[in-house]
Amino acid sequence: SIPWNLERITPPRYRADEYQPPDGGSLVEVYLLDTSIQSDHREIEGRVMVTDFENVPEEDGTRFHRQASKCDSHGTHLAGVVSGRDAGVAKGASMRSLRVLNCQGKGTVSGTLIGLEFIRKSQLVQPVGPLVVLLPLAGGYSRVLNAACQRLARAGVVLVTAAGNFRDDACLYSPASAPEVITVGATNAQDQPVTLGTLGTNFGRCVDLFAPGEDIIGASSDCSTCFVSQSGTSQAAAHVAGIAAMMLSAEPELTLAELRQRLIHFSAKDVINEAWFPEDQRVLTPNLVAALPPSTHGAGWQLFCRTVWSAHSGPTRMATAVARCAPDEELLSCSSFSRSGKRRGERMEAQGGKLVCRAHNAFGGEGVYAIARCCLLPQANCSVHTAPPAEASMGTRVHCHQQGHVLTGCSSHWEVEDLGTHKPPVLRPRGQPNQCVGHREASIHASCCHAPGLECKVKEHGIPAPQEQVTVACEEGWTLTGCSALPGTSHVLGAYAVDNTCVVRSRDVSTTGSTSEGAVTAVAICCRSRHLAQASQELQ
């Protein structure tokens, strides 16, 4: 019967007793930077080309016995998971292996850098179809390694990496912390985060998604027909590299941004038990388990968005946090979150010719996060309209006044500390839904976009009694672009998007009391693109 991991990544419509994905990734080449491999294993012989690249440190210890099958173990298994005939994800993908890890599984930053440069040069000398680079390794944070990954990604290469097996924040490791890399955590057959001895999968905002990574059957270097189970985020990353190869084989023109958005979109949502993660990491860690799309074609009509969290600002009074979208993505909204509730909101601002989302800490606050909603919106023209604090008691309001521009997100930012303390809630006037409204002491920012066929609507969910969490979701066919709270009273910790749901978090209700101050409204802006839908129908 089908191994659990292959069943897990297969959409229900393809599920059978055997794993038979619609396309095997035959147009894609996957580069594996790992240990040496046993290339004559029946799983991968003829599918994996061993390059002459080798850059590894000496093994530790004078009594180390170099045994070929041990040296090849990790790489052989991963090559099998990616493209193995029997237990592989992308059975049609061809691979090239580079040796950057020694027989003890250790490597160096310099060896990996030279390996990445080798791939870049190979790509220039002999351009092929789409390239996926699998980096099933993790070391301490390295600015230079992250920069090398960024360069390769900007040259059109898809990089997939392991989050790391340290039961820690993936942002502390490289290449996992590189924003351009697709970083993968590991889950088990119960969709729970993988525990490995006293440690386990890494987590946090630098993880893009999770994938099967425990008890994964794959090629064993013990013998040419042997199979073995291995576990870890390397195995999880290999699954995503295989899925990416299949997606790229079906749609070779996909950009890295488009691929990442699709991986997120087609993942299984909210299946991981977040209690395994440290409390402060739960909100930052994506609850996503990778899966193949139900159809390899026809996803083009959807408006894809993802949520990007910034690093924590730190606690100083004027501290800020910045969240950025990828180069090919549009920032459609910006929100902020603080566990203490002490924040001065957020704003969208231009930086290097691109909009970023900046959140501001408040005096006495423990720090803030900026949360960007990053979307794929071809031919978009977006701008931010700002209304300074209003004199009138009705509060500050701003709308999209340019012809053909629609509201995709609202942000508010204020200079005074603890805005909203003992202030009545601001209510949006009836019949004027497409504008941003806030306190009169706040400056309000509206994200206004023009794109062919783009239409958006505002959806609200208000709860009169105090509650720790208020949510509002966009319906089927619509995508959440903006998420904010109305009003910005002091007990609101912030707002953020989780998949297609806008979440507004408040302070513990026991400390709030049940006055009108407890009323919280979550405001979602839901958009869709009729242009993308029509374009997709024409292609079919």
Partner: antibody, heavy 119, light 113 residues
Framework: QVQLVQSGAEVKKPGESLKISCKGS????????ISWVRQMPGKGLEWMGI????????KYSPSFQGQVTISADKSISTAYLQWSSLKASDTAMYYC????????????WGQGTLVTVSS | DIVMTQSPDSLAVSLGERATINCRSS????????????LAWYQQKPGQPPKLLIY???TRESGVPDRFSGSGSGTDFTLTISSLQAEDVAVYYC?????????FGQGTKVEIK
């Protein structure tokens, strides 16, 4: 029900060519390896070679390399064993067997094809 | 190539008695990563294709009577029929499947005494 059905018995003259077949049903033919095994009259089992129908990757026993060709047509779930020039010593029963990958061994066998080569 | 040698070549056992067949491989078929022996036993009755009895040296294939058992590790293996039945008259083959070429033992013929 999972089964392998082989083509019927053949009587040939030395020097003639021959292609025998093995059709899989009741399972995903593409995803399982097919081995061919020879059994000469009154003798034991000899593994000849194997094919993965998904990509037609083959592996031969050194004893049979160059003597026979193994192929497959996944569109009709059929594997083949062929000779370009038969010899009297090729007289034998030939079995195809499905190879289950995790336990790489032969869990399902065809009924066998008897090939007789005689002048 | 891994050479498989079976003993005895033939064996005559009374109904209800124990039959024991040995198989030796020229090199170990036990692998440390999954601690499995890549050895199988097959039964072939006259005019029929072989039938899988045992894999991983000691795991019975589903539907195989429990009077058949396999043991051994590394290079030395045994197939035991605890109480021979009339329908067990056949030739039994061991097979290694750890590396290409896959190889069989020469076979052991089991008859009723």
């Amino acid at each position: 029900q999972v089964q392998l059905v082989q083509s019927g018995a053949e009587v040939k003259k030395p020097g003639e060519s021959l292609k025998i077949s093995c059709k899989g049903s009741g399972y995903s033919f593409t995803n399982y390896w097919i081995s061919w095994v020879r059994q000469m009259p009154g003798k034991g089992l000899e593994w000849m070679g194997i094919i993965y129908p998904g990509d037609s990757y083959t592996k031969y026993s050194p004893s049979f390399q160059g003597q026979v060709t193994i192929s497959a047509d996944k569109s009709i779930s059929t594997a083949y064993l062929q000779w370009s020039s038969l010899k009297a010593s090729d007289t034998a029963m030939y079995y195809c067997a499905r190879d289950y990958w995790y336990k790489p061994l032969f869990d399902i066998w065809g009924q066998g094809t008897l090939v007789t080569v005689s002048s | 190539d891994i050479v498989m040698t079976q003993s005895p070549d033939s064996l005559a056992v009374s109904l209800g008695e124990r039959a024991t067949i040995n198989c030796r491989s020229s090199q170990s078929v036990l692998y440390s990563s999954n601690n499995k022996n890549y050895l199988a036993w097959y039964q072939q009755k006259p005019g029929q294709p072989p039938k899988l009895l045992i894999y991983w040296a000691s795991t019975r294939e589903s539907g195989v009577p429990d009077r058949f058992s396999g043991s051994g590790s590394g290079t030395d293996f045994t197939l035991t029929i605890s109480s021979l039945q009339a329908e067990d008259v056949a030739v039994y083959y061991c097979q290694q499947y750890s590396s290409f070429p896959i190889t069989f033992g020469q076979g052991t013929k089991v008859e009723i005494k």
